[in-house]
Interface confidence: low
Amino acid sequence: LSTCKTIDMELVKRKRIEAIRGQILSKLRLASPPSQGEVPPGPLPEAVLALYNSTRDRVAGESADPEPEPEADYYAKEVTRVLMVDRNNAIYEKTKDISHSIYMFFNTSDIREAVPEPPLLSRAELRLQRLKSSVEQHVELYQKYSNNSWRYLGNRLLTPTDTPEWLSFDVTGVVRAWLNQGDGIQGFRFSAHCSCDSKDNKLHVEINGISPKRRGDLGTIHDMNRPFLLLMATPLERAQHLHSSRHRRALDTNYCFSSTEKNCCVRQLYIDFRKDLGWKWIHEPKGYHANFCLGPCPYIWSLDTQYSKVLALYNQHNPGASASPCCVPQALEPLPIVYYVGRKPKVEQLSNMIVRSCKCS
Amino acid sequence: LSTCKTIDMELVKRKRIEAIRGQILSKLRLASPPSQGEVPPGPLPEAVLALYNSTRDRVAGESADPEPEPEADYYAKEVTRVLMVDRNNAIYEKTKDISHSIYMFFNTSDIREAVPEPPLLSRAELRLQRLKSSVEQHVELYQKYSNNSWRYLGNRLLTPTDTPEWLSFDVTGVVRAWLNQGDGIQGFRFSAHCSCDSKDNKLHVEINGISPKRRGDLGTIHDMNRPFLLLMATPLERAQHLHSSRHRRALDTNYCFSSTEKNCCVRQLYIDFRKDLGWKWIHEPKGYHANFCLGPCPYIWSLDTQYSKVLALYNQHNPGASASPCCVPQALEPLPIVYYVGRKPKVEQLSNMIVRSCKCS
């Protein structure tokens, strides 16, 4: 492979490897690898492995997320599980004979133990294991809102399945709201989608750990498969660094246009179709703010500079641990135009024309 | 601004401007600007301006979309409107006395006129103008499926509003399916969300051009505000190039790992924590496929090479019309790890660790 000068493939790999070294430490806010002196012998505890697998499965089932990430998202997230309040609790009494819904209650003090402050929560998922089923059903999820009211959160069309399968609902906003309130019991309702015409509004889907016990329920003895919240949060001690002076800036028009930033930033550029391109054929708009990205993204050697100060720079200058980080567009927007083909005016949309923000990548 | 060598800011701007020249022509698949000889005098037709504004408003209300784009998405999209079948049509007779829903029917031959082939459709939105309302209501959209059945498409929580406002539903899949069928009448149902408990399942939301006429209906005389489909499609003549040999490849692991691509591509790199980093403190996983991006992204001068062949290269090598395109990650994935702090095992998720695909940006 060659660009202008010959690329030393081994050197690129070495630089990438060393960048990853710094990246991982920096994401964990560690100045050096933690001591292994106190690690107990033997395999990992089963609960830890189960949690690790939940997290890994979540990754497998998701598409990549190239959204601009807030500063806190750069850092590692601690993953915890909060099980729903036990079904024997009196709070479930009133819900027993309702055929269209099942209910899951959670103790917010358990959640607060895992996430002491609402802004630390990065993601919360409600996980339910659905048992095998031969029917298709449209289901809905609600949040307990006030004494007798429920707020709609989302829906899913569940097709028949031969094996138990996990359902996952993003409930980050709900859990963050609970953390903003006092301690207490909060809950979700999982319901059949009730049709305006239909008479049969029974929930046919069975959830492990809630629906009446059947042979074949998997591992309910171990509590592993009853509904739970999967929480991802920035640990409190790591969060204290987030508001320090060396924070990750959004390299967007708000920041870049009003600063004298020498490093990677979005630079202002207005294209006037007539003046800049000598074009009269685009009728609307007359021009647009195209902008462009410019500025260095220094490569940071983590080998000879294993200090917190240097590691903090990864976040801004090389968050992807690239062997040669580059200043490129992050958020782009489309541009609609009006032009003529012969006598016929056309409206067309051009994708990714306007650079809104940049990043080192 | 300086990187290793001083950057000539004016030259960068000039290169960006010339890149945009090539970019726009290339997106429109034009070898040169279209002739203006036949353009009628006077202002743009009102319907064209309304359509342009619809498109521009759609852009204003949306966040940037940094998703990997299929090849067809690179090119410009022609925008058209298809109005719903007139309310006086006999097809609406059966639906008049239903209080929980309103119905909107469309003639697929009108849609086919705008989009001759299903794959050309890039996006279809159902646009409804809701009249001012003092109530909050949870509404749902359904697609006509067979004679008497309706398929759920989506929902919206509509809060009170003092002014009429446009609602937009993405119905791309539905419209594409209609185009795959024969000509005929197809429809949508806009319904109250019927609760399992509630007795009042009446639709309180009023839609311009459907709900009983009230003073204050805006511009129904001009038909501008009755429900319509906003369609974005690749014009037929532009589409014929899409399957040519010089197509835009996904620079992902599937393609790059099995090819000898010299230009920008994702390159294979497995990090073994122990061997590569000398680390024993990460217990799971033992390593991961980090990968990296490498290879040139040639800058294309559009000034002296205004030919279709060269313009086609923009799509692969410089889709963002950058002054200095760079090979960078496109799709990234997180990595969950298990490690110990003292005696306490921790599961943490590290964002953007695995490079799945690259792009010239």
Epitope: S146, N254 | D57, G61, S133, V135, E165
Partner: antibody
Framework: EVQLVESGGGLVQPGGSLRLSCAAS????????VHWVRQAPGKGLEWVSH????????YYADAVKGRFTMSRDNGKNTLYLQMNGLKSEDTAVYYC?????????????WGQGTQVTVSS | LPVLTQLSSMSGSPGQTVTITCTGS?????????LSWYQQLPGTAPKLLIY???NRASGVPNRFSGSKSGNLASLTITGLQAEDEADYYC????????????FGGGTKLTVL
Amino acid sequence: EVQLVESGGGLVQPGGSLRLSCAASGFTFSNYGVHWVRQAPGKGLEWVSHISAAGISRYYADAVKGRFTMSRDNGKNTLYLQMNGLKSEDTAVYYCAKDRIRSSYEYDSWGQGTQVTVSS
Amino acid sequence: LPVLTQLSSMSGSPGQTVTITCTGSSSNIGGGYYLSWYQQLPGTAPKLLIYNANNRASGVPNRFSGSKSGNLASLTITGLQAEDEADYYCGCYDSSLSTGYVFGGGTKLTVL
């Protein structure tokens, strides 16, 4: 830290005009609806106007409709209130306030206020 | 007259519990719209105490709580302290008015 700083108040004669500004920082301005609220001397709070996050929708109290115009410049993180045809009953401290969530009409951050006095 | 009705003044001794009420109608509080409570200390800008009827804003002590029933909203302060002496306003979106938003007339709370 979220900050809203009003400016542009002062003494003006009846029938005159003033333009108030509100500079925002510490949050993504373009993601939130913002409002003007006023408080006449010794009186309670009175909602004046609201502009949506993108600046597309604007709403005004009946008392100011047709005389006041609210606008925003998301590039400059600034909110404006153009007040024309001022009356003595417009005398008040004018606060700008940000929505807690996009357009919730719950004001989780307020400016310090700017005094507008309409008097001959 | 304000669409949301509050008592103009109330008083309480330190340590006591006081409840400030705000009465509306089905077009505002009863309609399920976001209801908030604000505290205005003398000479300062108002501050959000409670949002969505019963949620404490960040940094607000848990002595303050909100509730709502039908057309009536309440703000309760337990363990009253001298620094709680202030004006308290309720506010809510109102769907019947072209104005859109209304504040109560305010309650002046004096700590004896």
